[in-house]
């Protein structure tokens, strides 16, 4: 009778992560008597995958009943495949021996390749906010994919970016891979509503790429422009002065009025108006009692925006002259404001 051969008909098997892999193996003879075992890898450190008689292998099932007398099908199924399962699997026939069974014949091996989807890309921006005209870096990370080939693109508001660097790790063979990319983005005043998108395409995604996004509203700081104007007389001895704070983002803003350098009132922006570009406008009023002043009054509107150093605009109020409408600053644009009267 011809000597037993162990046949593994599949040179390679490709399985998606989470699926079940079937590894086929048949023997050509029932002799010699002894068990079949499955290993991953070869040599002394090989990993035991299945032993039909001993050991705990909860993920492995046999295709046929190995206890049947004439069984020569030793194929197995491995459930819930992960990238860590990739490798070459050998079906090995043992001959009963003493004290231990002796390896008799091995199959040629079946290479199991695992296709694993990349994780959802995570986009992160700079830790601190930056102002328009500055360049900021965004990173995008995705993990756990296999095979290694992957494509990553960056977009800002639908427009593809070109200034980025991408690495796929590790460089050599691995069960799964990670991608890391850093893109540089120049901020503009209109970027409050902008989005940066990282798009990852991989063979496992069947043409439907994964996207990660970052809102530039989390990154940008648009500093305000200030304009202080004097309003028409309301009463013989009272003058109304307004400070228009325009085009700022985020909303966190504190305004202080100073009369001749002395703090008159401090308030926090609350009822603001939003512009189409996502920035905010706000207006604060100060009612000045002229009769309480003998000399000219220097009124200063001081604004601290988002924890940054204060910016200010001043207006000189002439006490000697009859209070007529006068302005110290020319308005840049005519925007609606939420008038807040505080006396």
């Amino acid at each position: 009778e011809e000597e037993l051969q162990v046949i593994q008909p599949d040179k390679s098997v490709l399985v998606a992560a989470g699926e079940t892999a079937t590894l086929r193996c048949t023997a050509t003879s029932l002799i010699p008597v002894g068990p079949i075992q499955w290993f991953r890898g070869a040599g002394p450190g090989r990993e035991l995958i299945y032993n039909q008689k001993e050991g705990h292998f909860p993920r492995v099932t046999t295709v046929s009943d190995l206890t049947k007398r004439n069984n020569m099908d030793f194929s197995i199924r491995i459930g819930n495949i992960t990238p860590a399962d990739a490798g070459t699997y050998y079906c090995v026939k043992f001959r009963k021996g003493s004290p231990d069974d002796v390896e008799f014949k091995s199959g040629a091996g079946t290479e199991l390749s695992v296709r694993a989807k990349p994780s959802a890309p995570v986009v992160s921006g700079p830790a601190a906010r930056a102002t328009p005209q500055h360049t900021v870096s965004f990173t995008c990370e995705s993990h756990g994919f296999s095979p290694r080939d992957i494509t990553l693109k960056w977009f800002k508001n639908g427009n593809e970016l070109s200034d980025f660097q991408t690495n796929v790790d590790p460089v050599g063979e691995s069960v799964s891979y990670s991608i890391h990319s850093t893109a540089k983005v120049v901020l503009t005043r209109e970027d409050v509503h902008s989005q940066v998108i990282c798009e990852v395409a991989h063979v496992t995604l069947q043409g439907d790429p994964l996207r990660g996004t970052a809102n530039l509203s989390e990154t940008i700081r648009v500093p305000p422009t200030l304009e202080v104007t004097q309003q028409p007389v309301r009463a013989e001895n009272q003058v109304n002065v307004t400070c228009q704070v325009r085009k700022f983002y985020p909303q966190r803003l504190q305004l202080t009025w100073l009369e001749n350098g002395n703090v008159s009132r401090t308030e926090t922006a609350s009822t603001v108006t939003e512009n189409k570009d996502g920035t905010y406008n706000w207006m604060s009023w100060l009612l000045v009692n002229v009769s309480a002043h003998r000399d000219d009054v220097k009124l200063t509107c001081q604004v601290e925006h988002d924890g940054q150093p204060a910016v200010s605009k001043s207006h000189d109020l002439k006490v000697s002259a009859h209070p007529k409408e006068q302005g110290s600053n020319t308005a840049a644009e005519n925007t609606g404001s939420n008038e807040r009267n505080i006396y």
Partner: antibody
């Protein structure tokens, strides 16, 4: 569900033999080895041997020389472990365990005393 | 035969503490064949870890196994009251199958 049910406690005199049974249910009896493991009072676990229920093939711990005999009855899905020439040091709880090492019998206490 | 030496013999710890149990083999054991068990008084051993590092079904994630060759470790990240028991390592790489002498984890 998978079960290994062992025979009851035994008290034996030195020099006698004891035969402990282990009845399997809930799985294909010929699937895996059945091992025998013992534990003397306050001591650790000691592997005695195993039997392949499919063909009766056995392996045993050389420590027991030829004192241990393992057999099986496929008609009742039962394996047996017989220990001969008993001595006081053989006083122990004897466990049968399925080849996956997950399923164990409840244990059989064997006391050897004159 | 492969002799498995467990240390320490006794580990006195409080609930919430981390337990690290060692098992050293007299000759190299492929990880696939190294198992860990928990045993409580009057009960049969219970499989905790198979193939050196895989958690058996129903075993809490606070248990973990590691190691290769001749040095293996069982770690309990934060002891629960029900974890106080005796732990055994076991090899079935070669005949005769052997167990370590056990480590008793007791309440301090």
């Amino acid at each position: 569900q998978v079960q290994l049910v062992q025979s009851g406690a035994e008290v034996k005199k030195p020099g006698a033999s004891v035969k402990v049974s282990c009845k399997a249910s809930g799985f294909n009896f010929e699937d895996t080895y059945i091992h025998w493991v013992r534990q003397a009072p306050g001591q650790g676990l000691e592997w005695m041997g195993r039997i392949d229920p499919a063909d009766g093939d056995t392996k045993h711990n050389p420590k027991f020389h030829d004192r241990v005999t393992m057999t099986r009855d496929t008609s009742t899905s039962t394996v047996y472990m017989e220990l001969s020439s008993l001595r006081s040091e053989d006083t122990a709880v004897y466990y049968c365990a399925r080849g996956n090492y997950v399923n164990w019998g409840q244990g059989t206490t064997v006391t050897v005393s004159s | 035969e492969i002799v498995l030496t467990q240390s320490p013999a006794t580990l006195s710890l409080s609930p919430g503490e981390r337990a690290t149990l060692s098992c050293r083999a007299s000759s190299s054991v492929t990880s696939s064949y190294l198992y860990w068990y928990q045993q409580k008084p009057g009960q049969a051993p219970r499989l905790l870890i198979y193939s050196a590092s895989n958690l058996a079904s129903g075993i809490p994630a606070r248990f973990s196994g590691s190691g290769s060759g001749t040095d293996f470790t069982l770690t309990i990240s934060s002891l629960e009251p029900e974890d106080f028991a005796v732990y055994y390592c076991h090899q079935w790489y070669s005949y005769p199958r052997t167990f370590g002498g056990g480590t008793k984890v007791e309440i301090k």
